[in-house]
């Protein structure tokens, strides 16, 4: 859990991930126009990738491409379109020195404010003390307790639970999500929500202040939804929303509720039936890995403004290659 705001370490600037296992390129001949500038003695322009700043997308960021494009036409500029997700975790700490050499001006430098503790509304400051296993790798932090910026996804592991939903997805309307109660009041809130119908199952968050509840019927769930914003126990305002966490629903569906409970329907005079078979397969409340991957996909979407240059494979060029060794 250490170091939420630390920039992810990418490969070193000089490393070439495509070198290993790649086919060797044709031997360069006398035609120097096919040689990249850095092989001809030119000083390469320093390229510093600029990750997305906290305050918003930075435009015109160039992606580093392999300089070893020998044997083809000169590389075309590739401009990535920024796929910014609102509320996505920042990749730069607000404590990093933004105006470091080579970075130029970013949106933050022009309007930096002193002592920013909470950036924008969704981000919440959580105090951390260096030396307690939460080192922030920042010289400014040494010996000073200060705020670590947590993204909503870090605060709430289900922040991205709706990201994987598509228009074709069918959500189970008998599930609701209840939130906003203190952890100590969870069982009390559960008692209250069992008044609105037969709860078959509920899944508690590991932080304890929200839960997914499955009712026996959609009608009962709708009744629970109508309690959104209601105050319980004089001081606890509760939110109730339809559950959008597919993983909880799907794992519950796999349990195959063979006999939904008819419990507490007074006219029926049968013995008590459980709402759940005892051999219920265990389900996990963690997000499926796929969700996590979807939430952390690349911030930059590469869009080439021209067709990618291909090596000329015509008969004439092959003859020229054979004759001149190009």
């Amino acid at each position: 859990m250490a170091a939420f705001a630390v920039e992810p370490q990418g490969p070193a600037l000089g490393s070439e991930p495509m070198m290993l296992g790649s086919p060797t390129s044709p031997k360069p001949g006398v035609n120097a126009q096919f040689l990249p500038g850095f092989l001809m003695g030119d000083l390469p322009a320093p390229v510093t990738p600029q990750p997305r700043s906290i305050s918003g997308p930075s435009v015109g960021v160039m992606e580093m491409r392999s300089p070893l494009l020998a044997g083809g036409s000169p590389p075309q500029p590739v401009v990535p379109a920024h796929k910014d997700k609102s509320g996505a975790p920042p990749v730069r700490s607000i404590y990093d020195d933004i105006s470091s050499p080579g970075l130029g001006s970013t949106p933050l430098t022009s309007r930096r404010q002193p002592n920013i503790s909470v950036m924008q509304s969704p981000l919440v400051g959580v105090t951390s003390t260096p030396g307690t296993g939460q080192s922030m790798f920042s010289p400014a932090s040494i010996g000073q307790p200060r705020k670590t910026t947590l993204s909503p996804a870090q605060l709430d592991p289900f922040y991205t639970q709706g990201d994987s939903l598509t228009s074709e997805d069918h959500l189970d309307d008998s599930w609701v999500t209840v939130f906003g109660f203190p952890q100590a009041s969870a069982s009390y809130i559960l008692l209250q929500f069992a008044q609105y119908g037969n709860i078959l199952k509920h899944v508690m968050s590991n932080t304890g202040n929200w839960m997914h509840i499955r009712y026996q019927s959609k009608l009962q769930a709708r009744k629970a939804l109508s309690k959104d914003g209601r105050i319980f126990g004089e001081s606890i305002m509760i939110g109730v929303k339809p559950c959008i966490d597919k993983s909880v629903m799907e794992s519950s569906d796999r349990c195959a509720l063979s006999s939904p409970s008819l419990a507490f329907t007074p006219p029926i005079k049968t013995l008590g039936t459980p709402t759940q078979p005892g051999s219920t397969p265990r389900i996990s409340t963690m997000r499926p890995l796929a969700t996590a991957y979807k939430a952390s996909t690349s911030d930059y979407q590469v869009i080439s403004d021209r067709q990618t240059p291909k090596k000329d494979e015509s008969l004439v060029s092959k003859a020229m290659e054979y004759m001149f060794g190009w």
Partner: nanobody, 120 residues
Framework: QVQLVESGGGLVQAGGSLRLSCVGT????????MAWYRQAAGKEREVVAG???????HYADSVKGRFTISRDNAKNTVYLQMNSLQPEDTGVYCC??????????????WGQGTRVTVSS
């Protein structure tokens, strides 16, 4: 597999007492919560009393001081002692037990209910 069977209901005069029992056929001693609910004709279900996670108890305002919920883990039983019964206490009383099946995942079990009628 847990099944809940209630007993102890019946007809009683106003001011009288009844003791409801809910026996779990299966281990309910580790229950997360245990509660009694009631539903009167034409009314919504309401929580009467509950033993919350941690052992504290909760009572509806209308029964405070008159009803007492308790549990006997050795007998896998939850009780509801009802004193000074009033006609408005009439209804079907149902037992509800919540058991943690896996970490953070809880299964809910309901009894069929036992009818309590308080005549004036």
């Amino acid at each position: 597999q847990v099944q809940l069977v209630e007993s102890g209901g019946g007809l009683v005069q106003a001011g009288g007492s009844l003791r409801l029992s809910c026996v779990g056929t299966g281990n309910i001693s580790s229950a997360y919560t245990m509660a009694w609910y009631r539903q009167a004709a034409g009314k919504e279900r309401e929580v009467v009393a509950g033993i919350l996670n941690g052992g504290s108890t909760h009572y509806a305002d209308s029964v405070k001081g008159r009803f007492t919920i308790s549990r006997d883990n050795a007998k896998n039983t939850v009780y509801l002692q009802m004193n000074s019964l009033q006609p408005e206490d009439t209804g079907v009383y149902c037992c509800h037990v919540v058991i943690e099946s896996t970490r953070f995942v809880y299964d809910h079990y309901w009894g069929q209910g036992t009818r309590v009628t308080v005549s004036s």
